[in-house]
Interface confidence: medium
């Protein structure tokens, strides 16, 4: 599923991401835009043999199990395929664990490079939340 901007903002808010660990909803929507272009089925392969999955591009080396990433930790205790569902519950729950890990949203390279320090509220402007 490819979410609309406001549709995703509403879904993320319903799942409790607004101000989760101090990160406003706009940060999460911005991260999703530049990680996956709002596409829940996005997959991207990394040079270390791992793969990033879903709307927030969660990595198989650390967070989920795709059955083929050497030394996978699977810290979210889920199959990576669950992160590709049109229901973003699994991605949100795992993202909450990631953002609580110490580096905050710096764990997402796209957030660090494209969202951090910008007017992230623009990503939810005009949305009925």
């Amino acid at each position: 599923k490819v979410f609309g901007r406001c549709e995703l903002a509403a879904a993320m808010k319903r799942h409790g991401l607004d101000n989760y660990r101090g990160y406003s909803l706009g940060n999460w929507v911005c991260a999703a835009k530049f990680e996956s272009n709002f596409n829940t089925q996005a997959t991207n392969r990394n040079t270390d043999g791992s793969t990033d999955y879903g709307i927030l591009q969660i990595n198989s080396r650390w967070w989920c199990n795709d059955g083929r990433t050497p030394g996978s930790r699977n810290l979210c205790n889920i199959p990576c395929s669950a992160l590709l569902s049109s229901d973003i519950t699994a991605s949100v729950n795992c993202a909450k664990k990631i953002v609580s890990d110490g580096n905050g949203m710096n764990a997402w390279v796209a957030w660090r490079n494209r969202c951090k320090g910008t007017d992230v509220q623009a990503w939810i402007r005009g949305c009925r939340l």
């Epitope: 997959t43 040079t47 059955g67 083929r68 050497p70 395929s81 590709l84």
Partner: antibody, heavy 116, light 107 residues
């Protein structure tokens, strides 16, 4: 136990298309990548690409882009590979395998012969 | 693409001999190297994963070693059922690639 059952041998004419199937049993089909491998005598094993059945995400070896197309039907736990514009170079045995990085589980292979 | 070069192309041995098969990668692949045996008209069978881990049900006479670019599959006291083709495969990056194979034949 995990099993991959491929469709039977095919004899096709040059220019035609063929669709090979791979039915998976014994594990959660949507969770693992299905990989496709080509074997020709004297050419060893070649990785064609992969599909994640749960999402339909696909990756292709550049060499096979435009030649192979992967699909999957999660209701029947079956992955498919279509090969188009067949030539004699496509005559080979085609395997599906479960993608665990390594390939512990293989189909029995589908022999494709392209001949006029 | 990562190229895998296997040597020798053919190895002629007598049952009871011990042999070593080599697989060399064109760049470092850590331990992401796997070995397969294939007999005529059969699918490949996984022997060794991640350079040195024997797959389930594989006899202890098969062992693997190596890391980086140089890998070895060893067969201690070859049995008649071991004759066939042996392939290595890397899973360090895409596209996945295989070696050209070593044929183990009876002398």
């Amino acid at each position: 136990q995990v099993q991959l059952q491929e469709s039977g041998a095919e004899v096709m004419k040059p220019g035609a298309s063929v669709k090979i199937s791979c039915k998976a049993t014994g594990y959660t089909f949507t969770t693992y990548w299905i990989e496709w491998v080509k074997q020709r005598p004297g050419h060893g094993l070649e990785w064609i690409g992969e599909i994640l059945p749960g999402s339909g995400s696909t990756y292709y070896n550049e060499k096979f882009k435009g030649k192979a197309t992967f699909t999957a039907d999660t209701s029947s736990n079956t992955a498919y590979m279509q090969l188009s514009s067949l030539t004699s170079e496509d005559s080979a045995v085609y395997y599906c395998a479960r993608g665990d990085g390594y390939y512990c589980y293989w189909g029995q292979g589908t022999t494709l012969t392209v001949s006029s | 693409d990562i190229e895998l070069t296997q040597s020798p192309a053919t190895l002629s041995v007598t049952p009871g001999d011990s042999v070593s098969l080599s697989c060399r990668a064109s760049q470092s692949i850590s331990n992401n190297l796997h070995w397969y045996q294939q007999k005529s008209h059969e699918s490949p069978r996984l022997l060794i994963k991640y350079a040195s881990q024997r797959a389930s049900g594989i006899p202890s006479r098969f062992s693997g070693s190596g890391s980086g670019t140089d890998f070895t599959l060893s067969i201690n006291s070859v049995e008649t059922e071991d004759f066939g083709m042996y392939f290595c495969q890397q899973s360090n990056s895409w596209p996945r690639t295989f070696g050209g194979g070593t044929k183990l034949e009876i002398k």
